[in-house]
């Protein structure tokens, strides 16, 4: 019987010889559960597993805890890969996180964290980040130390308000913090002075809602 080849992330897909961008099926070791993820095989050497993408407002990101846990959307377009998969993956080896951003004026920038992982669901998928470099701000727009994940039905932030309901989307909200890449998608010329847009403060400042975002991870030793 031929052994089934499975890949835990896009780095393994890349190393197996599949070097074309696209949607691939990933499976964690010792698991039968599969997820479909978009693999970027070109940017910065390839092997990037896309865990979030915003590009046109076609997908609703105001979702429940369970939806953010298992993932939603379309891996070829706007989607969230899923907190459970990302948590398990990033606790098996060391990963870097790259966040690529686009504004409405044709500019692009990125933030690269040299170590990224999510805690377990029991710890509310708290984000852990170390070692920021890149062009999207010298200060991390994801609050440090990292916060628990919050959604419209799971209020784990540090605010007297409910950030996920006020700003929309699931995120590692503080009170509410300098970023929310899962906020409301606003079209061009309607994207400023927004209280609930797609925000990365230390690049574009307050109230500016971005055109596009991609969050991607790759093993640190790739």
């Amino acid at each position: 019987k031929e052994e089934q080849i499975s890949f835990r992330d896009c780095a393994e897909v890349f190393k197996s010889g599949h070097t074309t961008n696209g949607v691939y099926t990933l499976t964690l070791p010792n698991s039968t559960e599969e997820v479909k993820a978009y693999c970027d095989m070109e940017a910065g050497g390839g092997g990037w597993t896309i865990i979030q993408r915003r590009e046109d407002g076609s997908v609703d990101f105001q979702r429940t805890w369970k939806e953010y846990k298992v993932g939603f959307g379309n891996p070829s377009g706007e989607y969230w890969l899923g907190n459970e998969f990302v948590s398990q993956l990033t606790n098996q080896q060391r990963y870097v996180l790259k966040i690529h951003l686009k504004d409405w004026e044709g500019n692009e920038a990125y933030s690269l964290y040299e170590h990224f992982y999510l805690s377990s669901e029991e710890l509310n998928y708290r984000i852990h980040l170390k070692g920021l470099t890149g062009t999207a701000g010298k200060i991390s727009s994801i609050s440090q130390p990292g916060n628990d994940f919050s959604t419209k039905d799971a209020d784990n932030d540090k605010c007297i308000c409910k950030c996920s309901q006020m700003l929309t989307g699931g995120w590692w909200f503080d009170a509410c913090g300098p970023s929310n890449l899962n906020g409301m998608y606003y079209p061009q010329r309607q994207n400023t002075n927004k209280f609930n847009g797609i925000k990365w403060y230390y690049w574009k400042g307050s109230g500016y809602s971005l055109k596009g975002t991609t969050m991607m991870i790759r093993p640190a030793d790739f």
Epitope: K158, C159, I160, C161, C163, M166, D174, A175, C176, G177, P178, N193, K194, F195, G197, K199, Y201, S206, G207
Partner: nanobody, 129 residues
Framework: EVQLVESGGGLVQPGGSLRLSCAAS????????IGWFRQAPGKEREGVSA????????YYADSVKGRFTISSDNSKNTVYLQMNSLRPEDTAVYYC??????????????????????WGQGTLVTVSS
């Protein structure tokens, strides 16, 4: 559409007074805090004063305490900054900005700069003889 429009800036002699206005539209002051900020050439933007109309709470930076007074007229959806005993170091572009009043960290009274998501274009205040 959320808009903030500042007015009232100008040239004034040291010791003089000005009253800045911040007219808000697209939201009501009841649910928001309004802050006044200033930025002098080559310097960082800094918080000057803020008000939560609903509870009447106010905040002042140490550098303006006793000289500046913030107030609001909810019927006009406008916030004012009365500036007395002006000094040359008060010279700056003054901005007003808004933040949902509830966006507060447990145990804290006021908001970091990055929480203010709506901003006006600013009004220039020059204090010079």
């Amino acid at each position: 559409e959320v808009q903030l429009v500042e007015s009232g800036g100008g040239l004034v002699q040291p010791g003089g007074s000005l009253r800045l206005s911040c007219a808000a539209s697209g939201f009501t002051l009841d649910d928001y805090a309004i802050g006044w900020f200033r930025q002098a050439p080559g310097k960082e933007r800094e918080g000057v004063s803020a008000i939560r109309s609903s509870g009447g709470s106010t905040y002042y930076a140490d550098s303006v305490k006793g000289r500046f007074t913030i107030s609001s007229d909810n019927s006009k959806n406008t916030v004012y900054l009365q500036m007395n005993s002006l000094r040359p170091e008060d010279t700056a572009v003054y901005y007003c900005a808004a933040v949902p009043a509830g966006r507060l960290r447990f145990g804290e009274q006021w908001y970091p700069l990055y929480e203010y998501d709506a901003w006006g274009q600013g009004t220039l205040v020059t204090v010079s003889s």
